[in-house]
Structures are given as structure tokens and as C-alpha cells.
């Protein structure tokens, strides 16, 4: 179930994942829900006495039973990943931060009024994931109202430091408040030359593209179906950028799909969830556990309730199958996505529903007749 | 169009720019409307992106630079490129266009008429060339369809221009012998149109020159006279396999 | 499937004569420009001559211009090269090939898609 | 006559690395009139690419070629075993037709 508590002067001994640093305890556990396999977190709002490069260290953790020993540390904050908490799930960070210095990659300086002006430019700018604004008061002259626009390779500031004068916060990418538009062009059989962050194996290009849009560094794609010549390649999303923002021309190329990330949208911006079931497809991944279920979309609905659930596979073969019903592999990875796809006949696959928004429709299912 | 002048709007309704929308939206080739259905354009136009999802086609325009995202356009349901049209040669050069949906036709947007085949002997002495490709060889895409006025030109006066290059029946050409008039890369696909017995006839299809409007070097075409019943019979065969699917 | 295949090279002495022959097949021979190209031992390649498909034009490049002589049968799909008064510089494998002339953006593309797998040609004393 | 010339003469890489070929010509070619072929030893040529950037039938993807006017560039995303080989720019735009003098690809 969902638990949203946070545990004040606490942190979680082991299961270490990655550290990163983040503004406050809020942040991180967002970070911790997006991240495929973060189930605690710990952050560090006070640094330890000779680890001054610990504070605002954010600490994502995993856990095979779902829990952690907690130890009392002094200024630390923990909890869990909001991963099955439907109704709070969002990416988006509004918070200003005063008196930090999120650091990363300046990659533009320009002068703005306001803070606000200075968020709206990150806002605006392809690139930019972070920000941090000199006020009229801060000691350096020349950089009053100062607006610094900042990236890093983790989408999160290489690292955080208290500085008087100087406010930080996030880009609204997130939040659908972007203005820079939102090409939802998909292109058959054309594939972008561009420079590839990451790659991922997907069932289609539109899995693809959703990962594309929740990665921080990725723009646009390639996707190589299942009829690409190179074999290692067949569906391999690669995930890419560029210095200018844009894809290059692209190349005709049989086979491949490209697009660009849906980040920037305001209406169409992809839940990060992929809800179809591939039927005649199995992926592989590390095996969690194995049930027997009737039908793939009880498969499903037993991978999105089992949170470390990442995808599953639901094989109709014989041998996989009992008076119950048949076998139903609940798996995990690293990045989230199988580690290889397989095409038979008698398996059908998808990915867990645990980072659907749970919709609160005002529109009652049972009408209720007034009096 | 090399040497040509602007055109007003509705002067050739049946013009159509073809455009590839990929990163960027770029206008690639003309076209000729013949049908509510229909576009008769080059097959070169469409070598290595054969693909009908990327072309966007737009019809009744004068101006190229006033399309926008919101400006209506076509989409491809079916392009039929002649069966004998090869990448390393230069004949059978002609593609047909089935639209996805039908156009409503207006005074800045109708087809053009297609010769009988008894015209492939016809004399035509009024033939214009009509697009939005470069103005010279080394030049830039035109906003504004440009025209001129050109004249036939013997096909064994064409072939002995171009001693490298077959010109079979299936082509025509059209040049001024001192050059300075032609079409240009850009307007491939578009029409040569002739008026005759006071209707105008889409007689060639824009194919290919050396350079543009150079002296001695006629532009060539597809003699679409020639093609009469392969258009006709493309354009029967694929109203037969809409009875087909269509539900009962 | 598109074959060209050449014969006729051989040793021959300084000042002598050599005729290749090139048999094509697998296409519409009269429809294409064809070219020589040759490569001299342990050299790059050199553009020798063509002849258009009705074999009524015809161009060299200045090594050649005044002693070899290209012709073609198009009766028999049979491209030719007449060499006389050869030289030892004219030592190379004689490739001919089919200039394949498409069309992009209204203009003509030029290129030798297909090659034979060459004759050698041997000028010495 | 239009003089190509290619650089670098000598390209020594190992497999999986990518090879930039470059190809100036002396005098402006039409892009339509520029090709790359592709020689190994006691082979005819090979047609690589076309009109200066449009891939032949059957050449693998990691082959592709741009420029235009006076420079042009043959690039092999990921070398294989087998592009180890000498490659030739050639320009029939004017006459005399004219070819580089060709670059050697060699395996480190």
C-alpha cells in the first residue's frame, strides 16, 4: 500500500541504490519514486560535523522485504517511495529554494527582474533542469540578478551549498507549464544520427518515446524494430541529444522509428507508465517471483500490487500452466525495462501500473438520485 | 522557374506543392490535381522517401509562406510509383497520389484536364511551366508560384541536345534555344500545361535538364499523353479494391 | 541480375595494338552511357572513356585522346575498346562499367553502378 | 580537368571506431554528380554512395555521405572488419570524369 510518512531523525542502514543531492527531504522522495527501483530514501538536511559534502545528500535505497533497519541520525529525514501512492504521484517540483546554490553545468547567464522571470526561462529553455537567481542583494555586484540556467547529467545539482542572496528551484517542464511546444511527430522508417545518452530495450516506439520523456537528458529517439538487421539492436530504443536541441536531418532508414521526447507538453505529456500488454512477446529481467493467474491483465494487476514489480511475463505454454491458472513471472531490472525481448507465440508482457496517477473523476460511476 | 514571373492566386488551381515534414517542413515537389482524388506528379520526387506519412500536400496556395500549422493540407492514402520507373535511369518517370480524403474543389483549387491519347501528336503552341523551385541554378525555393511561357521542342532536336541521354516517346520538351526560361530543382512534378482548342491540357510532367535554362538545353518531361491508360487504369484498379474492403 | 564481363587483355609490346570487349547482360544495354576505367598496379583509379547509349558520342580523357577508341554493338549488348600505339604507362587492369543516370530535384544524378571484374593489359618490351 | 583531392591519405582505426573520409574537389561539383566507391584488394570498385549522400542498394547504414559544392565527406559510423579498404571520391559533373587518389583504410 501507499506510505507517504516521513521519519524524522532517521536513517536507513544498507540497501544503497545511488546518492544524489537534493534541495529537501520532498525532493528526494520524489526522486526515489521515479528512480525503477527506489523503495526507501534518506536525506541528510544536516551535514555530519567532518562530512560537510554529506548535506543534502539524498539516499535511494531498496529493499527485498520492503523495509530497512532504521538507525537515529540527528537531522536526517526517511521514508518511501510514493510508488503505489496514486493520487500524489507527480514530477513536478514548484518549491524555491532560498539561500542555495544548486549546482550543475551553467550553460546560460542572463539578467532577469525576478525570480519567477528566471524560473519561466528555465522553463522555456530545452536544456535547462535547474536554476539558481543572484538577488539584488547578493555580495557580487556583477551578478545581481543574475539568472544562471544549469543542467546536469542526472537531471539533479552536482551538488548543493548554502549561499546568502541566491535562490534556486526547478524547471516546470514537469509541471506542463512549458511553452516551447510539443512535437508529437513520429517517424517511420527515418532514424536520428544524434549523440545517444542511454539506450533501453522497449516493446515499440511508443514505450520508447514515454521513456524519452522521463529521462533527463533525452530529447528525441530512435527506435529499432524487431525487423532490424543487427540483431543486439532489434528493439533497443536510443535515447538522444543534441547541443543545438534539434535533432539533425534524419536518416532513411528501413526499420527504425524516430520522435522527439514529450517533456515539453502541456496536454499530451505521458503518463510514466505504459499500460498495453504485449500478447506473442516475453520479457526477461531478473525473476522476482512467479504466480499463477487467470489471464495477463490479472498478471498485470498482481505486478502493479507487488511493488518491486517492474514488468512481467504471462506464459500460456502447458507446462506453464495449473488448475489455478498459468504462470504469471513478475521481474525487475535496473533501468526499469526488460533486459531483452523475446517474440513466442504463447507469452504476453507489460509493465507494472505502479506510476499510473489513480484519476479522480468527478463523475460519479453509481448516479445517486436526488430527492 | 527560371525566368519566370509571379502568379496570381487561382491563375493554375490545379498546382500543389508536395511537402516532406520531418524535423523541418520543406517543399520538395509540385503536382497537378486531376482528380478529387488525385495528384499526377514525378516518381523521382519520391526516391529514398517513398514513405506517404511524411508528405503533406497543399492545394488552392499562392504563397508558400504564408502555410502555417494551421493551414489544411493532404495526406497521402496510396502512392502508386509506374512499375517501370528505375532509380538508375531517367524514363517512366511519373507517380500517382491517391489522397486520404476527397478535396472540395473551389475557384483556387480544380483539376486540371488530361490530353486523349490522340494528343501525343497534337501541336501545342501556348504551354506554360508553373512552380516553386529555384529561379536559377544555385538559387533557393520561391514563396510566391511562379510561371512562364515556353516553347515544344522536337524530340529528335531534344535528342540530339542530349547526345548522353535517351529521349524516348514518352518524353517531351520544352526550351528556349538561348536558354534563359526553364524550370529548376523544386519544381519537379509540377505541371506543363498547353491551352488547346481553349482548354488548358496537362501535357508534361517536370522531369529533368542539365543545369537550368542553359542554352541549347531544353527541359524535359513526361509526356503524360502517353500515360493515359496507365493513369486510368491505376486510378480504376484502386476504386475496384475500395469496393473490395468497403463493408458490405 | 546486371553482369559485365571483360576479355581481350594481354602482354603486348610498346607501339602495338589491343582490343577489349565488354559482354553485358541482365539489363537493357542500349538505355545506359558506358564507361572504361583502369588502375595501374598499385595505383588509384583513372577514368579512361565513355560512350552514349546510341554510341554516337563519345569523350576521352587527354592520355588516351587520339589513340584509344570506344564503340559499342548494342545488337549484341557488346562495349569495345580499340587501343592503339600503347605504352607502358597504358599497364592496368581495364575495368568497364554501366553509368547508371537517375534523376534527383529536376537534374540528372551520374554514377558507374556497375563493374566488371577487369581485364589485365600488359605494355612491355 | 576538376582535380579531387582526398584526405587523410592513410586512415589507420580499429573496428567499432568511425572514419571520416574527406573529399575537396577544385572547382564547384553538383552534389548529383559526386559518388564514393569502395576497393579491396584484386576487387573491381564497389558503388558506395550516390549523389553525394544517397546510399547504394545493399550498402549498410553505417555508410553515409554529405557535403556539397566543393567539400564532401564519406563517414562509417562503427568500422567492421570488412570496410578495412581503399575508398575513392569521384566526380562526373564536368569532363574528364575524375577520381581522388583514393584514402586507405588500415586496421590499427
Known amino acids: 500500500g501507499c506510505l507517504s510518512q516521513l521519519y524524522a531523525n532517521t536513517f536507513f542502514r544498507g540497501g544503497d541504490l545511488a546518492a544524489i543531492y537534493t534541495p529537501d527531504a520532498q525532493h528526494c522522495q520524489k526522486m526515489c519514486t521515479f528512480h525503477p527501483r527506489c523503495l526507501l530514501f534518506s536525506f541528510l538536511a544536516v551535514s555530519p560535523t567532518k562530512e560537510t559534502d554529506k548535506r543534502f545528500g539524498c539516499f535511494m535505497k531498496e529493499s527485498i522485504t520492503g523495509t530497512l533497519p532504521r538507525i537515529h541520525r540527528t537531522g536526517a529525514i526517511s521514508g518511501h517511495s510514493l510508488k503505489q501512492c496514486g493520487h500524489q504521484l507527480s514530477a513536478c517540483h514548484q518549491d524555491i529554494y532560498e539561500g542555495l546554490d544548486m549546482r550543475g553545468s551553467n550553460f546560460n547567464i542572463s539578467k532577469t527582474d525576478s525570480i519567477e522571470e528566471c524560473q519561466k526561462l528555465c522553463t522555456n529553455n530545452i536544456h535547462c533542469q535547474f536554476f539558481t537567481y543572484a538577488t539584488k542583494a547578493f555580495h557580487r555586484p556583477e551578478y545581481r540578478k543574475s539568472c544562471l540556467l544549469k543542467r546536469s547529467s542526472s537531471g539533479t545539482p552536482t551538488s548543493i551549498k548554502p549561499v546568502d542572496n541566491l535562490v534556486s528551484g526547478f524547471s516546470l517542464k514537469s509541471c506542463a507549464l512549458s511553452e516551447i511546444g510539443c512535437p508529437m511527430d513520429i517517424f517511420q522508417h527515418f532514424a536520428f544520427a544524434d549523440l545517444n545518452v542511454s539506450q533501453v530495450v522497449t516493446p515499440d516506439a511508443f514505450v520508447c518515446r514515454t521513456v524519452c520523456t522521463f529521462h533527463p537528458n533525452c530529447l528525441f529517439f530512435t527506435f529499432y524494430t524487431n525487423e532490424w538487421e543487427t540483431e543486439s539492436q532489434r528493439n533497443v530504443c536510443f535515447l538522444k541529444t543534441s547541443k543545438s536541441g534539434r535533432p539533425s536531418p534524419p536518416i532513411i532508414q528501413e526499420n527504425a522509428v524516430s520522435g522527439y521526447s514529450l517533456f515539453t507538453c502541456r496536454k499530451a505529456r505521458p503518463e510514466p507508465c505504459h499500460f498495453k500488454i504485449y500478447s506473442g512477446v516475453a520479457f526477461e529481467g531478473e525473476e522476482l517471483n512467479a504466480t499463477f493467474v487467470q489471464g495477463a491483465d490479472a498478471c498485470q494487476e498482481t505486478c502493479t500490487k507487488t511493488i518491486r514489480c517492474q514488468f512481467f511475463t504471462y506464459s500460456l505454454l502447458p507446462q506453464d500452466c495449473k488448475a489455478e491458472g498459468c504462470k504469471c513471472s513478475l521481474r525487475l531490472s535496473t533501468d526499469g525495462s526488460p533486459t531483452r525481448i523475446t517474440y513466442e507465440a504463447q507469452g504476453s508482457s507489460g509493465y507494472s501500473l505502479r506510476l499510473c496517477k489513480v484519476v479522480e473523476s468527478s463523475d460519479c460511476t453509481t448516479k445517486i438520485n436526488a430527492r | 522557374i527560371v525566368g519566370g514571373t509571379n502568379s496570381s492566386l487561382g491563375e493554375w488551381p490545379w498546382q500543389v506543392s508536395l511537402q516532406v515534414k520531418l524535423v523541418s517542413q520543406n517543399h520538395m515537389c509540385g503536382g497537378s490535381i486531376i482528380g478529387r482524388q488525385w495528384i499526377l506528379t514525378a516518381a523521382h520526387c519520391f526516391d529514398g522517401i517513398p514513405y506517404p506519412d511524411v508528405w503533406r500536400i497543399y492545394g488552392g496556395i499562392l504563397n508558400l509562406s504564408e502555410i502555417t500549422n494551421k493551414t489544411p493540407f493532404s495526406s497521402i492514402k496510396e502512392l502508386i510509383i509506374h512499375q517501370k520507373y528505375k532509380m538508375s535511369e531517367g524514363s517512366y518517370d511519373i507517380a500517382l497520389i491517391k489522397l486520404q480524403t476527397p478535396l472540395n474543389y473551389t475557384e483556387f483549387q480544380k483539376p486540371i484536364c488530361l490530353p486523349s491519347k490522340a494528343d501525343t501528336n497534337t501541336i501545342y503552341t501556348n504551354c506554360w511551366v508553373t512552380g516553386w523551385g529555384y529561379t536559377k541554378e544555385r538559387g533557393e525555393t520561391q514563396n510566391i508560384l511562379q510561371k512562364a511561357t515556353i516553347p515544344l521542342v522536337p524530340n529528335e532536336e531534344c535528342q540530339k541536345k542530349y547526345r548522353d541521354y535517351v529521349i524516348t516517346k514518352q518524353m517531351i520538351c520544352a526550351g528556349y534555344k538561348e536558354g534563359g526560361i526553364d524550370a529548376c530543382k523544386g519544381d519537379s512534378g509540377g505541371p506543363l500545361v498547353c491551352k488547346h482548342s481553349g482548354r488548358w491540357q496537362l501535357v508534361g510532367i517536370t522531369s529533368w535538364g542539365e543545369g537550368c535554362a542553359r542554352k541549347e538545353q531544353p527541359g524535359v518531361y513526361t509526356k503524360v499523353a502517353e500515360y493515359i491508360d496507365w493513369i486510368l487504369e491505376k486510378i480504376q484498379s484502386s476504386k475496384e479494391r475500395a469496393l473490395e474492403t468497403s463493408p458490405a | 541480375e546486371v553482369q559485365l564481363l571483360e576479355s581481350g587483355g594481354g602482354l603486348v609490346q610498346p607501339g602495338g595494338s589491343l582490343r577489349l570487349s565488354c559482354a553485358a547482360s541482365g539489363f537493357t544495354f542500349s538505355h545506359y552511357l558506358m564507361t572504361w576505367v583502369r588502375q595501374a598496379p598499385g595505383k588509384g583509379l583513372e577514368w579512361v572513356s565513355y560512350i552514349s547509349p546510341s554510341g554516337g558520342h563519345t569523350i576521352y580523357a587527354d592520355s588516351v585522346k587520339g589513340r584509344f577508341t570506344i564503340s559499342r554493338d548494342n545488337s549484341k549488348n557488346t562495349l569495345y575498346l580499340q587501343m592503339n600505339s600503347l605504352r607502358a604507362e597504358d599497364t592496368a587492369v581495364y575495368y568497364c562499367?554501366?553509368?547508371?543516370?537517375?534523376?534527383?530535384?529536376?537534374?540528372?544524378?551520374?554514377?558507374?553502378?556497375?563493374w566488371g571484374q577487369g581485364t589485365l593489359v600488359t605494355v612491355s618490351s | 580537368e576538376i582535380v579531387l583531392t582526398q584526405s587523410p591519405g592513410t586512415l589507420s582505426l580499429s573496428p567499432g571506431e568511425r572514419a571520416t573520409l574527406s573529399c575537396r574537389t577544385s572547382?564547384?561539383?553538383?552534389?548529383?554528380?559526386l559518388a564514393w566507391y569502395q576497393q579491396k584488394p584484386g576487387q573491381a570498385p564497389r558503388l558506395l554512395i550516390y549523389?553525394?549522400?544517397s546510399r547504394a542498394t545493399g550498402i549498410p547504414d553505417r555508410f553515409s555521405g554529405s557535403g556539397s559544392g566543393t567539400d564532401f565527406t564519406l563517414t562509417i559510423s562503427r568500422l567492421e572488419p570488412e570496410d578495412f579498404a581503399v575508398y575513392y571520391c569521384?566526380?562526373?559533373?564536368?569532363?574528364?570524369?575524375?577520381f581522388g587518389q583514393g584514402t586507405k583504410v588500415e586496421i590499427k
Open positions: 562499367a554501366r553509368v547508371a543516370r537517375g534523376i534527383a530535384a529536376r537534374s540528372r544524378t551520374s554514377y558507374f553502378d556497375y
Open positions: 569521384q566526380q562526373s559533373s564536368r569532363t574528364p570524369w575524375t
Open positions: 572547382q564547384f561539383v553538383n552534389s548529383n554528380y
Open positions: 549523389g553525394a549522400s
